[in-house]
């Protein structure tokens, strides 16, 4: 193809007459704003086509592109289509006239637009402002385009100065609609409710603004339909919220209730479930086992620690000897009830520095108006053993005795030993136990009494030995399952002239 | 808190009318233009018709002028589109949408099928 003048941007005279030629091998056409404007078209004697476009009285209004194209323009070529773009300075005319389609800019995503207010003269300043700014943006113009680039949701217009006059074009609307891929949380307000009361549950939708919310629940499907409420969270930017509302639940109402979210732009979906159920009267059930025996070690703190879940929450009372506990001024009790999800609950009860005092009974009550249960131990203190005695004596029968007296709970055992060989045992050899074997020459005698008061165990041990030869390192051990201890003495011959 | 709450939707058959509303709120319609834009199933969004604030100005596409008309109520604060002579493919979600602010508001969209 080839145009004449070839342009590709001519500046013509207003009210003058001017000839646009275009030629090629085959017929040609002159195209203008899609239509085809009056023209004359040949074919000369060697078969060149060609086409005459005559624009007579020029007007600002007949500033634009111009495209002489091949008339069979099936699969068009970039060689088969040529682009002239022609100014008519006229001062008579601001902007071009858009058509409305123009003036409204819809976008889905963040891409560069053009706001398409042009003029008749490329030697005018155009700047572009927010309808409701003096400011001028700092956007790049094209004269035979318009401004390009990235735009706010706003509304803009143009301005230019044709001598003296300053001129406003059309406003331009844009609008972007957030749209991004779904991602749907569902929550209820309880997940487990009692006949007769509500069950409200919301779907929350991020990042998008058209959206449409469909919800099935078990009375949907019973054809008992509730209409759901949409609103748009204020403090968060797109952000759109679906509340469903049951009033006065019934048992059938318990099941699985689904939000399910579609966005037509993208033809985007998701959809989140959550259970609800609902139960005919409240309830308290324990969770786990507790011992009907519970330990603490004296001087050391303990938590004892219950499990249960309850609906609706319950109160929890904590006893001891039959009496309220509660949080003391000294700090040496501490009680807590947390809530760990919506229905299960942990109850602690913290001893500070266990006494033997707080050995007892203990129970916890949990209850509301529908139901209630406790759990009752007998907290036990371990007491670590402790060697309070150690002697030995030599009664007149000739025998020789030890006497070792200890106390701790639970109830100690004790370990009687020797050391015979006194430069070697106990580090090279170990010590013998002593009992009550027939082959050793020695006896034994235990004795224990439980001291009420104390709440321990005293363990009193006599340990004869028959002769001694030589002197005997002797070992008391006792030991319970909160510790050990030991002490020994050196018991030596009656022959010998010193103990 | 701007909010854009449509109505009106319905099927229709071809050659039948059919009103969609959208009542505003959070905002004044006077000071805003709005406009109607729809999607049609697999098509991308068309801007359909618009309204300046004062109602003086009306704005249709090439597809829908001479059918559809564009009012609005500024005492109630609702703009409506009256579509008269509607076809198969005006079958689409419509939406209406408005500035406010910094940003741009829509409607919840609206179902109009043509079919007969």
């Known amino acids: 193809l080839v145009v004449t003048p070839p342009g590709p941007e001519l500046v013509l005279n207003v009210s003058s007459t001017f000839v646009l030629t275009c030629s090629g091998s085959a017929p040609v056409v002159w195209e203008r704003m899609s239509q085809e404007p009056p023209q004359e078209m040949a074919k000369a004697q060697d078969g060149t086509f060609s086409s005459v476009l005559t624009l007579t009285n020029l007007t600002g209004l007949d500033t634009g592109e111009y495209f002489c194209t091949h008339n069979d323009s099936r699969g068009l070529e970039t060689d088969e289509r040529k682009r002239l773009y022609i100014f008519v300075p006229d001062p008579t005319v601001g902007f071009l006239p858009n058509d409305a389609e123009e003036l409204f800019i819809f976008l889905t995503e963040i891409t560069e637009i053009t706001i398409p207010c042009r003029v008749t003269d490329p030697q005018l300043v155009v700047t572009l402002h927010e309808k409701k700014g003096d400011v001028a943006l700092p956007v790049p113009y094209d004269h035979q385009r318009g401004f390009s680039g990235i735009f706010e949701d706003r509304s803009y217009i143009c301005k230019t100065t044709i001598g003296d006059r300053e001129v406003d074009s059309d406003a331009y609307y844009v609008y972007r609609l957030q749209v991004s891929s779904i991602n749907v949380s569902v929550n209820a307000v309880q997940t487990v409710v009692r006949q007769g009361e509500n069950i409200t549950l919301m779907c929350i939708v991020i990042g998008n603004e058209v959206v449409n919310f469909e919800w099935t629940y078990p009375r949907k499907e019973s054809g008992r339909l509730v209409e759901p409420v949409t609103d748009f969270l204020l403090d968060m930017p797109y952000h759109i919220r679906s509340i469903l509302h049951i009033p006065s639940a019934e048992l059938e109402d318990s099941g699985t209730y689904t939000c399910n979210v579609t966005e037509s732009v993208n033809d985007h979906q998701d959809e989140k479930a959550i259970n609800i159920t609902v139960v005919e009267s409240g309830y308290v059930r324990l969770l786990g086992e507790v011992g009907t025996l519970q330990f603490a070690e004296l001087h050391r703190s303990r938590t004892l620690q219950v499990v249960f879940e309850a609906y609706p929450p319950p109160t929890v009372l904590w006893f001891k000897d039959n009496r309220t506990l509660g949080d003391s001024s000294a700090g040496e009790i501490a009680l807590s009830t947390r809530n760990v999800s919506e229905t299960r609950y942990v109850s602690e009860l913290t001893l500070v520095r266990v006494k033997v005092a707080e050995a007892g009974h203990y129970t916890m009550r949990a209850f509301h108006e529908d139901a209630e249960v406790q759990l009752s131990f007998q907290l036990q203190i371990n007491v670590p053993v402790r060697v309070l005695e150690l002697s030995e004596s030599h009664p007149d029968s000739g025998e020789q005795t030890v006497r070792c007296r200890g106390r701790g709970m639970p109830q100690p055992n004790i370990i009687w030993s020797a050391c015979r060989d006194l430069k070697r045992c106990p580090r090279e050899l170990p010590p013998t136990l002593l009992g009550n074997s027939s082959e050793e020459e020695s006896q034994l005698e235990t004795n224990v009494t439980y001291w009420e008061e104390e709440q321990e165990f005293e363990v009193v041990s006599t340990l004869r030995l028959q002769h001694v030869d030589r002197p005997l390192s002797v070992r008391c051990t006792l030991r319970n399952a909160v510790g050990q201890d030991t002490q020994e003495v050196i018991v030596v011959p009656h022959s010998l002239p010193f103990k | 808190q701007v909010q854009l709450v449509q109505s009106g939707g319905a099927l229709v058959q071809p050659g039948g009318s059919l009103r969609l509303s959208c009542a505003a709120s959070?905002?004044?319609?006077?000071?805003?233009?709005m406009s109607w834009v729809r999607q049609a199933p697999g098509k991308r969004l068309e801007w359909v018709s618009a309204?300046?604030?004062?109602?003086?100005?009306?704005y249709y596409a090439g597809s829908v002028k001479g059918r559809f008309t564009i009012s609005s109520d500024n005492s109630k604060n609702t703009v409506f589109l009256q579509m008269n002579s509607l076809r198969a493919e005006d079958t689409a979600v419509y939406y209406c949408?408005?500035?406010?602010?910094?940003?741009?508001?829509w409607g919840q969209g609206t179902l109009v099928t043509v079919s007969s």
């Open positions: 959070g905002f004044t319609l006077s000071n805003n233009a």
């Open positions: 949408a408005t500035h406010g602010g910094d940003r741009s508001y």
């Open positions: 309204i300046d604030g004062s109602g003086g100005t009306t």
